[in-house]
Each structure stands twice: as structure tokens, then as C-alpha cells.
Interface confidence: low
């Protein structure tokens, strides 16, 4: 059946060196265990993380994300996943696209990551 892919509506913010989580889900919710799920970075479709055939695939992963990503699949049975990126870099700032592919049917959602310098970050108050 068809579905929509939903990501965060507002930019997600992270500090350099921290880890960040990018959530993504399908609606209506359904079991996505057997689907292909991934994140890539436009405009050159650099693969950030790919989950296929029930396991993470590092073979197409862009080298700058090697060892830095983890797909949190606790709720994949409900069609919800989260991409965790560790050791955030300034070069991670910008657009990410999350996609779900069920056989030949694919939908995706765009999201944005803002990366800030911790030395210029001041907590309010």
C-alpha cells in the first residue's frame, strides 16, 4: 500500500562534536522491517546510511559517514526510525533526505541539520 514519509518540520540543531538524531516515519504507520530505509544527502545522493534486507549496508555509504551513523530501529515495526550521527562535523550541516522503499514504491522526506560551534553557543539565562 501507499504511504507518506514524514520528517521533522523544523531544522534540527546540533553542536560540533556532539551526536544528533534525525527522526523519520511513514504514515499511516506500518511495519517497515522488510522495507529499504535510508538517508542520503542531496544534490549528489551521497549515502549517509542504508538499511536493506533486514540489516545495515555500509557498502554504498559515503566515507565521511563511515563509523559515525546508527539506525535506531526500536519502533521500525510501527514505521518509525531515527538516524543517529555521532561526532557531528560542520560539513554535516545542510539537507538530508530520508526514504522508505517498499518493493518499487518509494517515498521520501527532506530535513535540515544546523551545526553550531559550541564555543559560540551560550545557554539562555
Amino acid at each position: 500500500g501507499q504511504f507518506r514519509v514524514i520528517g521533522p518540520r523544523h531544522p534540527i540543531r546540533a553542536l560540533v562534536g556532539d551526536e544528533v538524531e534525525l527522526p523519520c516515519r511513514i504514515s499511516p504507520g506500518k511495519n517497515a522491517t522488510g522495507m529499504e530505509v535510508g538517508w542520503y544527502r542531496p544534490p549528489f545522493s551521497r549515502v549517509v546510511h542504508l538499511y536493506r534486507n533486514g540489516k545495515d549496508q555500509d557498502g554504498d555509504q559515503a566515507p565521511e559517514y563511515r563509523g559515525r551513523t546508527e539506525l535506531l530501529k526500536d519502533a521500525i515495526g510501527e514505521g518509525k526510525v531515527t538516524l543517529r550521527i555521532r561526532n557531528v562535523r560542520f560539513s554535516d550541516e545542510g539537507g538530508f533526505t530520508c526514504f522508505f522503499r517498499d518493493h518499487s514504491y518509494q517515498e521520501e522526506a527532506a530535513m535540515e541539520l544546523k551545526v553550531e560551534d559550541p564555543f559560540y553557543w551560550v545557554s539562555p539565562g
Epitope: F44, V47, D58, G59, D60, A62, P63, E64
Partner: antibody, heavy 116, light 107 residues
């Protein structure tokens, strides 16, 4: 130990065709994107084509687009490059390489000579 | 296409020398820069990926730096087995492109 072994090179006339093969071993072939890179005699390296793990995404250099086709057979751990309408400027050593953005292992290469 | 320009095209050095090769991209490529070593009649070998990350098994005398458009490969103490041709490669955009190479020869 990762090994990539190319074959299929040789002498061919302009306008002719060749099919290169690359037999892979020592790693899970189906989990990695693969590429072809070539090197004309005495010249530098030129990326030719890349194919994703399942073969559902392919990309080509403009110089070969429409003439070359990259493919793979994961059941045989083999990468292919079908080269049609060959030109003199396609003369080169063709290397298969593991990876899509960064080529961490290379085969020894196979020489393709296009000449009449 | 992004053009990659290496300098020098060739250099002569002695064992123990510190050698620096530079690579310039025609537009910013962030840190998407790899370095390869190639010996005559052999396939290239990956040394450095993502500008500064040492490939597994590569001696620590090799190092890479830079981001944006300017990059450097440094060999801290040249060894006899390091005499070869070195290529940079950008992997920021398709098509991936290589520099013309830098040949390191024995003085």
C-alpha cells in the same frame, strides 16, 4: 584478503565491442558498490562508471555515456563493463575498484587497445 | 566538472626527506579528497580518504590535510618504497575527478 581480478581486455577495432569482467573475492561483494577506473598509456586516472550494491543505481563519465554499460552479478561475485562503439581514445588499462566514492581496493587491470 | 590540479608535477627527493604535494580543486569540495599511490605497472593504492583519514595499513609517515579547495599530502620521512606517482581525487561530485599526478623520483 581482498582480490579483484579483471579479464576480457584485448585488441579491438574502432567501432567494436568488448566485455570486461572483474571477479571479486575476500569480501562480501553484494554489500559494496563497485566502479571502473581507466588509465590511458602514460596518462593519469579517469573514473569511468559506478554501480550500487544491487545494481539499481549506475552512473557514467560523459566520455562513455551511452556506449558503456556497467552491471554486476552478485551470485557470481562478478562486475562487468560492456563497451560498445569503441574509439581510439578508449585505449587504456581498465581497473575495477571496490567502492563508489573512495576506491579502497583495485584490481591489477586489463589492457584494452582500440586500433585498426 | 571539478578540475583537480596537483603541484609539482614531479619532484626529486632523497630518503629521509620531508615531501609535500599539493592539490587544488577548481571549486570547494569540503573534505571530499582522497590520495592514492601508484607504482609503475601496478594498480593505485588508497593512502588517505576524506582529506585526512589514514587508510588501514598505511604507514603513519603519510598524512593529509586541507579542506575547501586546497589540500596537502605529506610524507614525513621519505622511504625507498615511497618513490611512486601520487594522485589526488575529489569525491564531492559526479563525475569523480583525479589530479594529473605527482611523480616522486630519487634525487
Amino acid at each position: 584478503e581482498v582480490q579483484l581480478l579483471e579479464s576480457g581486455g584485448g585488441l579491438v577495432q574502432p567501432g567494436g565491442s568488448l566485455r570486461l569482467s572483474c571477479a571479486a573475492s575476500g569480501f562480501t561483494f553484494s554489500s559494496y558498490a563497485m566502479s571502473w577506473v581507466r588509465q590511458a598509456p602514460g596518462k593519469g586516472l579517469e573514473w569511468v562508471s559506478t554501480i550500487s550494491t544491487y545494481g539499481d543505481y549506475t552512473t557514467y563519465a560523459d566520455s562513455v555515456k551511452g556506449r558503456f554499460t556497467i552491471s554486476r552479478d552478485n551470485s557470481k561475485n562478478t562486475l562487468y563493463l560492456q563497451m560498445n562503439s569503441l574509439r581510439a581514445e578508449d585505449t587504456a588499462v581498465y581497473y575495477c575498484a571496490k567502492g563508489s566514492y573512495t576506491f579502497d581496493y583495485w584490481g591489477q587491470g586489463t589492457l584494452v587497445t582500440v586500433s585498426s | 566538472d571539478i578540475q583537480m590540479t596537483q603541484s609539482p608535477s614531479s619532484l626529486s627527493a632523497s630518503v629521509g626527506d620531508r615531501v609535500t604535494i599539493t592539490c587544488r580543486a577548481s571549486q570547494s569540495i569540503s573534505s571530499y579528497l582522497n590520495w592514492y599511490q601508484q607504482k609503475p605497472g601496478k594498480a593505485p593504492k588508497l593512502l588517505i580518504y576524506s582529506a585526512s583519514y589514514l587508510q588501514s595499513g598505511v604507514p603513519s609517515r603519510f598524512s593529509g590535510s586541507g579542506s575547501g579547495t586546497d589540500f596537502t599530502l605529506t610524507i614525513s620521512s621519505l622511504q625507498p618504497e615511497d618513490f611512486a606517482t601520487y594522485y589526488c581525487q575529489q569525491s564531492n561530485a559526479t563525475p569523480s575527478t583525479f589530479g594529473q599526478g605527482t611523480k616522486v623520483e630519487i634525487k
